[in-house]
């Protein structure tokens, strides 16, 4: 998913990508930065009391196509967006919770920015 005005010229993805991490920082992360061969993500979830919880981190390349798609979960709301174009790109991701009682979102496209 490209932002308005963003260049369509291909950009070489860093071999090792650095991402901001919050609640999903591995043991070896420093200053809330993790490293990956895959994607950075930002995720929003709704807790039991209905409060939105925003977290972020690194996704390995293996299986990231599944992670970066909004896969359905029962009775709760969750949305995730992924990016690869530059280090710490997930600082600029702002996923929103899907509408209540609307499961249409779950089969939507993979969210890449």
């Amino acid at each position: 998913k490209k932002e308005d005005g963003e260049s369509t010229a291909p950009t070489a993805r860093p071999k090792v990508l650095r991402c901001k991490c919050h609640h999903h920082c591995p043991e070896d992360s420093v200053n809330n930065i993790c490293s990956t061969d895959g994607y950075c993500f930002t995720m929003i979830e709704e807790d039991d009391s209905g409060t939105p919880v925003v977290t972020s981190g690194c996704l390995g390349l293996e299986g990231s196509d599944f992670q970066c798609r909004d896969t359905p979960i029962p009775h709760q709301r969750r949305s995730i967006e992924c990016c690869t174009e530059r280090n710490e790109c997930n600082k600029d991701l702002h996923p929103t919770l899907p509408p209540l009682k609307d499961r249409d979102f779950v089969d939507g496209p993979i969210h890449h920015k």
Epitope: H23, H24, C25, P26, C34, F41, M43, E45, E46, D47, D48, V53, T55, G57, C58, L59, G60, G63, F66, Q67, T71, P72, I73, P74, Q76, R77, R78, I80, R103, V106
Partner: antibody
């Protein structure tokens, strides 16, 4: 790649307790629910419960609430299940399984990566 | 608890066949139905989630369908490596529950 390592077998006496381990590697341990599943010889699969390594939050199958206790050690990326007051009914293969989806507070129901299982034998 | 029923406990088929394994839930599970393969050595693999989505690395000869309470797993062009026991699992409501399994054998 994702790996879940479990000991092959444990032999325990009736009435005792045992702590089964599941060492995770190849992913960020704290980001995914870990599930535990029981399989008695020649039988189907029973979900015991799940634990989120980051928060320590758990959900148990009522049938196992007085039998199983789930814990994690984040520093070694290891999940544990303690089974207490063991009887022959507890003799089974116990599997740990990592969920498919990254989660922080939501509960996710997809057992995507499985350990090889630990054969628990309860016998005097 | 939601009961999951796999009425066929064992099934014989020939290599190259198309095989369908069915699973029924005791109540509507809103497509939160997953399929697993257990090999004779005990190894368990995740095949299909949310009724019809293939997990990574699963051959495209596997497919899933269904809705409400009735679901099925289909294997096209059965191969020797598909000989295993297949379990369905509902993920709609805690506690998660599994079907009793369908053992697939070669004729």
């Amino acid at each position: 790649q994702v790996q879940l390592q479990q000991p092959g077998a444990e032999l325990v006496k009736p009435g005792a307790s045992v702590k089964l381990s599941c060492k995770a590697s190849g992913y960020t341990f704290i980001s995914y629910w870990m599930h535990w599943v029981k399989q008695r010889p020649g039988q189907g699969l029973e979900w015991i419960g799940m634990i989120h390594p980051n928060s320590g939050s758990t959900n148990y199958n009522e049938s196992f609430k007085s039998k199983a206790t789930l814990t994690v050690d984040k520093s070694s990326s290891t999940a544990y299940m303690q089974l207490s007051s063991l009887t022959s009914e507890d003799s089974a293969v116990y599997y740990c399984a990592r969920d498919l989806l990254i989660a922080t507070v939501v509960v996710t129901p997809y057992f995507a990566y499985w350990g090889q299982g630990t054969i628990l034998t309860v016998s005097s | 608890d939601i009961q999951m029923t796999q009425t066929t406990s064992s099934l014989s088929a020939s290599l190259g066949d198309r095989v369908t394994i069915s699973c029924r839930a005791s109540q509507d599970i809103s497509n939160f139905l997953n399929w697993y393969q257990q090999k004779p050595d005990g190894t368990i693999k995740f095949l299909i989630y949310y009724t019809s989505r293939l997990h990574s690395g699963v051959p495209s000869r596997f497919s899933g369908s269904g809705s409400g309470t009735d679901y099925s797993l289909t294997i096209r062009n059965l191969e020797q490596e598909d000989i295993a026991t297949y379990f369905c699992q509902q993920g709609n409501t805690l506690p998660y529950t599994f079907g009793g399994g369908t053992k697939l054998e070669i004729k």
